[in-house]
């Protein structure tokens, strides 16, 4: 059987300041069991962008319906983009455990921010 893949189809996304950025992510399987999280950057200093369980992420909304069964679309939208949001965003699948452990990461989507049109 094929192992779960994390697919970030967009290598890069360019958004005007003040607009919203949609970062696409899908997985190919419902298992292994465990959450999806979004990060900016890689390595130990990476910044958590969205986690469904803990934290407050007022600028982030999920693209898929909150009641969608067997959801495999973990795309997010980040509102009111500023130049400070530029960077590479990773969709990461975790395997459930104590604690959860990283299972597989998407290839990343680089977000660049254009100047707000005058």
């Amino acid at each position: 059987e094929e192992e779960l893949q994390v697919i970030q189809p967009d290598k890069s996304v360019s958004v005007a300041a003040g607009e919203s950025a949609i970062l696409h992510c899908t997985v190919t399987s419902l298992i292994p069991v465990g959450p999806i999280q979004w990060f900016r950057g890689a390595g130990p200093a990476r910044e958590l962008i969205y986690n469904q369980k803990e934290g407050h992420f007022p600028r982030v909304t999920t693209v898929s319906e909150s009641t969608k069964r067997e959801n495999m679309d973990f795309s997010i939208s980040i509102s009111n983009i500023t130049p400070a949001d530029a960077g590479t965003y990773y969709c990461v699948k975790f395997r459930k455990g104590s604690p959860d452990t990283e299972f597989k990461s998407g290839a990343g989507t680089e977000l660049s921010v254009r100047a707000k049109p005058s």
Epitope: I31, P32, P35, T62, S66, T67, N71
Partner: antibody
């Protein structure tokens, strides 16, 4: 139509072993996590164990004694129960996991159950 | 471990009446709560998930509400086949998945 059919229950002495099976049909078995839930006579529901792909999870009450496994080529879920105790006496249900959006698992289809009695 | 407390343990209702019972979680589970019905001698059946979404094929007389720590299952106009035990289950934080102790709905 989703169907789950448990087998392998019976009477066993304390300290003994049993292997339960759950034959699944009507859905893509390998794509879903599967779970065992038990119900002691006259009591409520108690989660026992869940398996994803290689990932397995157990209730503290059975950890180290029970082993959950699956054979996707046979569409079958198993529960190997060792060192059985009187308090393991229950109807054991196999259930298919379902998820909603970004959340955890609940159980949308259940088998009819198989009775395990641990008694000397 | 999240503890779910269901009340009342038993509810006596006449056919055609409304039944309302609750499930209280020991900590916030957001909307990650399901309700099951278990008729005598049968396996549990999923009624509601995500606190308020009816499973396909479940009659409209069943409705779920609440979020966080307080949840309610309501059955309007009880039918004879609704006399059963009802369990809530949280899937916000696991393992373990936890179930409430159940509410038995009996004929008055």
């Amino acid at each position: 139509e989703v169907q789950l059919l448990e087998s392998g229950g019976g009477v066993v002495q304390p300290g003994g072993s049993l292997r339960l099976s759950c034959a699944a049909s009507g859905f893509s078995f390998s794509n879903f996590a599967m779970t065992w839930v038990r119900q002691a006579p006259g009591e409520g529901l108690e989660w026992v164990s869940t398996i994803g792909s290689g990932d397995t999870y157990y209730a503290d009450s059975v950890k180290g004694r029970f082993t959950i496994s699956r054979d996707n080529s046979k569409n079958t879920l198993y529960l190997q129960m060792n060192s059985l105790r009187a308090e393991d006496t229950a109807v054991y249900y196999c259930a298919k996991d379902s998820t909603v959006s970004w959340s955890g698992d609940f159980f949308d289809y259940w088998g009819l159950g198989t009775l395990v009695t641990v008694s000397s | 471990e999240i503890v779910l407390t269901q009340s009342p343990a038993t509810l006596s209702v006449s056919p055609g009446e409304r039944a309302t019972f609750s499930c209280r979680a020991s900590q916030n589970v957001k909307n990650d709560l399901a309700w099951y019905q278990q008729r005598p001698g049968q396996a549990p059946r999923l009624l509601i998930y995500a606190a308020r979404i009816r499973e396909t094929g479940i009659p409209e007389r069943f409705s779920g509400s609440g979020s966080g720590t307080e949840f309610t299952l309501t059955i309007t106009s009880l039918q004879s086949e609704d006399f059963a035990v009802y369990y809530c289950q949280q899937y916000y934080d696991w393992p373990p998945f936890t179930f409430g102790g159940g509410t038995k709905v009996e004929i008055k």
